[in-house]
């Protein structure tokens, strides 16, 4: 039975040219995380497999860094980065948990920063 829950940063905003950390946290379960997929709508950004480690899509490798933890750091943000991001946690023995984050990249300096997850 799947008892866990995924906590995410929810809806976040950041400035163009800045950086942001996409973070999900799996709680309320003792299941072992075997793999985390980070996806942006129809694209696979990165995979972190417990046995293989991280693999980042070449299309994003200059702007995406693994971590901290199972999170993903997006750098040199553009307005085209605005959209939905999904963290897909594959676990044993529970199965699959999915979290959703909506990122809005703003042109001006009025972006409301999620301080806990924002990189200066």
């Amino acid at each position: 039975m799947m008892t866990g829950t995924i906590e995410t940063t929810g809806n976040i905003s950041a400035e163009k040219g800045g950086s942001i950390i996409l973070q999900c946290h799996l709680s309320s379960t003792t299941a072992q995380v075997t793999q985390v997929n980070w996806e942006q709508q129809d694209q696979l950004l990165a995979i972190c497999n417990a046995d293989l480690g991280w693999h980042i899509s070449p299309s994003f490798k200059d702007r995406v860094a693994p971590g901290p933890g199972l999170g993903l750091t997006l750098q040199s943000l553009t307005v085209n980065d605005t959209g939905e991001y999904f963290c897909i946690y594959h676990t044993y023995p529970d199965g699959t948990y999915t979290g959703r984050i909506f990122l809005e990249v703003l042109e001006s300096s009025v972006a409301e920063h999620g301080a806990r997850f924002q990189i200066p």
Partner: nanobody, 118 residues
Framework: EVQLVESGGGLVQAGGSLRLSCAAS?????????MGWFRQAPGKEREFLAI???????LYADSVKGRFTISADNAKNTVYLQMNSLKPEDTAVYYC???????????WGQGTQVTVSS
């Protein structure tokens, strides 16, 4: 127990093509989180090539992007690697690996030899 069996390797001339297959048999847990292809040349470390997820999203290594294509037939529990414009430096043992959704660890195949002659 799940087993992965690769096939399709062999000897090919530079510039040629090969299609590798990796079939999963046994208790495949109905779905996978990821299936991927790797290779290891003599005296070198294992190299990541390509990954496909259960949602058919793909990720490639820079070294093969544009030449190699990964695909899957979920009904047959099989993943493929189409390799075009092969070069002598592509010579290696090619392995497939799978992370099944309800499995604790990655499963590896036994490998298939690919030799590209000049």
């Amino acid at each position: 127990e799940v087993q992965l069996v690769e096939s399709g390797g062999g000897l090919v001339q530079a510039g040629g093509s090969l299609r590798l297959s990796c079939a999963a048999s046994g208790r495949t847990f109905s779905s996978y989180a990821m299936m991927g292809w790797f290779r290891q040349a003599p005296g070198k470390e294992r190299e990541f090539l390509a990954i496909i997820t259960d949602g058919s999203k793909t990720l490639y290594a820079d070294s093969v992007k544009g030449r190699f294509t990964i695909s899957a037939d979920n009904a047959k529990n099989t993943v493929y690697l189409q390799m075009n414009s092969l070069k002598p430096e592509d010579t290696a043992v090619y392995y497939c690996a799978a992370q099944f959704i309800l499995a604790r660890h990655l499963v590896w195949g036994q490998g298939t030899q690919v030799t590209v002659s000049s």
